[in-house]
């Protein structure tokens, strides 16, 4: 028998520095977690103690904090090189800055192979990108070899900016021939490493012949055997065992997100490459694990540029940006409109001639808007200003919901109107009329939504049975501010870009902004 230790991360999303327990900015260092300096300490400890160790990343290193905004992926290559990752799969967010934003900072600079078997380049890009990522990699580990085959969510064209010259194929269809090729090379221990979410990970384990282990990402799935060490609730045991169609027991793992945990899986193989046993658990990277001093020093050196960036002008406003709770928790506010417009703009993807865009709607809890921005400071808007408006380090995500769920959400928005509560929704691509004289749960008298399958966008009444795409904060997708119906009834959820980054990019693009209050939210009673 031969034993392999798989260390794995996924959906790190730019958390290079240690974070608080909820993966936001670290405030009290003695209670902070994660970060690459702490991760390195643990990885090195395991490498020294165990003979056959692989360190793998299942994608979405890109996007999530000011580190990515400023360094655009160079920080990912630098620190992953320093940690000596063995391989990485491409995630959807690796395409957020287009193909060039992947090639130059990461693909050309990574000392470790970057993988995806189901992304195929065509046209002029094919020769440019050829060999810069691989479908699979054979890694020598001790006296053996291990094959790693990569995959990426085929939804990436809707979630990021891969352009028109990359084709995202069905994962299972693309993986099988690559696994077969590895078999012909006499590689009999094969790990599928990828970024398509836990449901697809399980399907790959079930359907792709020859895959021994699946290491996944995208769905931020937390798996754990025994009593979990922090706040995350396990979606199942670690590893999650799938019985393949050909009768094998295939371990599937994921390690939550944001570098909070290091996945730790021990696999025992027989001489023919069959998995005999698998066990492990994610390791919580809490403050009991010291930060490596040399990596920490390097982080501090790279940090300097971030502090300078925070005070630079992104663009100008010529109007007061009303982000006060007195406005945004009671009525349409122009800060809410600005943020929603930025959210839609960030999700413009012309992937189908029938649709002007794949999504037209935005909802945003008023309680998530934490500060106004005064235009009487020469109109200047900085990252620092935006961080005061959106201080929680969230993301703006894409969900699919039925019209009936949206109707419930808007009823919830005003079910206890007048108490300055955070659930009052700001909107984009939606016209809503409330009648507060009616009883809670029956106050939405008109709800019109902007069409997507149209050449001239116009507002049509919401259809209860239709499925709509909506951009909203991850806080709402997770049922925050009492929006349990969204969490319970959503049909799909893909995590998006950092909230501040979305708004800052929009302001930089527009240069000068002047959002208005324009009748997106109306009240049909005379008192409003």
């Amino acid at each position: 028998a031969w034993e392999l230790t798989i260390l794995h991360t996924n959906d790190v999303h730019s958390r290079l520095e240690q974070t608080s327990e909820d993966s936001s900015k670290c405030v009290n260092a003695s209670r902070c977690m994660g970060g690459v300096a702490r991760l390195f300490t643990k990885v090195q400890q395991i490498r020294r103690a165990e003979p056959n160790v692989l360190l793998l990343d299942a994608g979405d290193q890109y996007q999530g904090t000011i580190w990515f905004t400023v360094y655009k992926g160079a920080e990912v290559a630098h620190f992953m090189n320093a940690l000596r990752y063995d391989a990485m799969a491409l995630g959807n967010h690796e395409f957020d800055n287009g193909v060039e934003g992947l090639i130059e900072p990461l693909l050309k600079e990574a000392k470790f192979p970057i993988l995806s078997a189901n992304i195929k380049a065509k046209g002029p890009l094919a020769s440019q990108i050829s060999g810069l990522y691989l479908p699979y990699k054979v890694l020598p580990v001790g006296d053996e070899v291990v094959g790693i085959v990569g995959y990426t969510s085929k939804e990436t064209p809707f979630l990021s900016n891969p352009g028109t010259n990359l084709v995202f194929e069905d994962e299972i269809t693309a993986l099988q021939p690559e696994v077969d090729k590895l078999k012909t090379l006499n590689v009999n221990k094969i790990i599928a490493l990828g970024h398509s979410g836990f449901e697809m990970d399980k399907l790959i384990a079930q359907k792709v012949r020859g895959v021994d282990v699946v290491v996944g990402g995208h769905s931020n799935t937390f798996l754990y055997t025994g009593n979990p060490p922090s706040k995350e609730v396990p979606a199942g045991k670690y590893p999650f065992i799938v019985t393949s169609d050909d009768g094998r027991k295939v371990p599937v793992v994921q390690a939550y997100a944001f570098g909070k945990y290091l996945g730790y899986l021990k696999i025992e193989f027989d001489e023919r490459g069959n998995v005999i046993s698998s066990h492990g658990n994610p390791i919580l990277l809490n403050s009991s694990i010291p930060e490596d001093p040399s990596i920490k020093a390097d982080i501090n050196k790279w940090r300097i540029k971030l502090d300078n960036y925070s005070t630079q002008e992104l663009g100008k406003t010529i109007v007061y940006l009303d982000g006060s709770s007195q406005s945004c928790r009671f009525r349409e506010c122009n800060m809410g409109n600005l943020i929603c417009d930025a959210m839609i703009n960030n999700n413009l993807r012309h992937t189908d001639e029938m649709f002007w865009n794949h999504v037209s709607m935005c909802i945003l809890n008023g309680g998530g808007i934490r500060s106004p921005i005064d235009e009487r400071n020469n109109g200047t808007i900085t990252w620092e200003n935006l961080a005061a408006v959106l201080p929680f380090g969230g993301t703006f995500d894409l969900v699919q919901l039925k019209g009936s769920t949206l109707k419930k959400a808007f009823e919830h928005s005003v079910h206890r109107y007048g108490q300055s509560t955070g659930e009052f929704l700001q909107v984009g691509g939606i016209h809503v009329v409330y009648d507060l004289s009616r009883k809670p749960g029956d106050r939405v008298v008109k709800l019109d939504v902007l069409c997507t399958k149209c050449r001239v966008p116009s507002y049509d009444p919401l259809k209860m049975d239709e499925v709509y795409k909506v951009i909203l904060p991850n806080f709402l997708a997770n049922g925050g501010d009492g929006f349990q119906m969204i969490k319970d009834e959503l049909l799909r959820h893909d995590s998006g870009d950092q909230d501040i980054n979305v708004v800052s990019t929009y302001i930089s693009k527009m240069k000068v902004i002047y959002p208005a209050v324009e009748g997106r939210i109306k009240f049909s009673t005379g008192s409003h």
């Epitope: 063995d86 600079e109 192979p113 060999g131 590689v187």
Partner: nanobody, 126 residues
Framework: EVQLVESGGGVVQTGGSLRLSCAAS????????MGWFRQAPGKEREFVAA????????QFADSVKGRFTISRDNAKNTVYLQMNSLKPEDTAVYYC???????????????????WGRGTQVTVSS
Amino acid sequence: EVQLVESGGGVVQTGGSLRLSCAASGRTFTHLAMGWFRQAPGKEREFVAAISNSGAGTQFADSVKGRFTISRDNAKNTVYLQMNSLKPEDTAVYYCAADWGTRDSPSKLNAVYDYWGRGTQVTVSS
């Protein structure tokens, strides 16, 4: 595009020497471990020599030990195979190969190498 281009092959008499070169482009050269393989007519492709990213680690096939040396010039993005005391059984097409990754000891295994050149013919006449 990642490309490997071999040169320096030719016809040489038994006991003679040749120096093969392989120029790499399209990827940071120091991120690649480099190897040489050869294939004689009707035979399997076989490992000859390999060198780690830094140049500190080398590996050789038993059949060429003491006769062949491998080196790299990271400034020129080139790896060299110096072949001395050549024998007729060294006749083959010689392929340059590159392994994306950083390992202290380069691999002898064909499957580990990700990029391949088109080969250069070496003929040792008796």
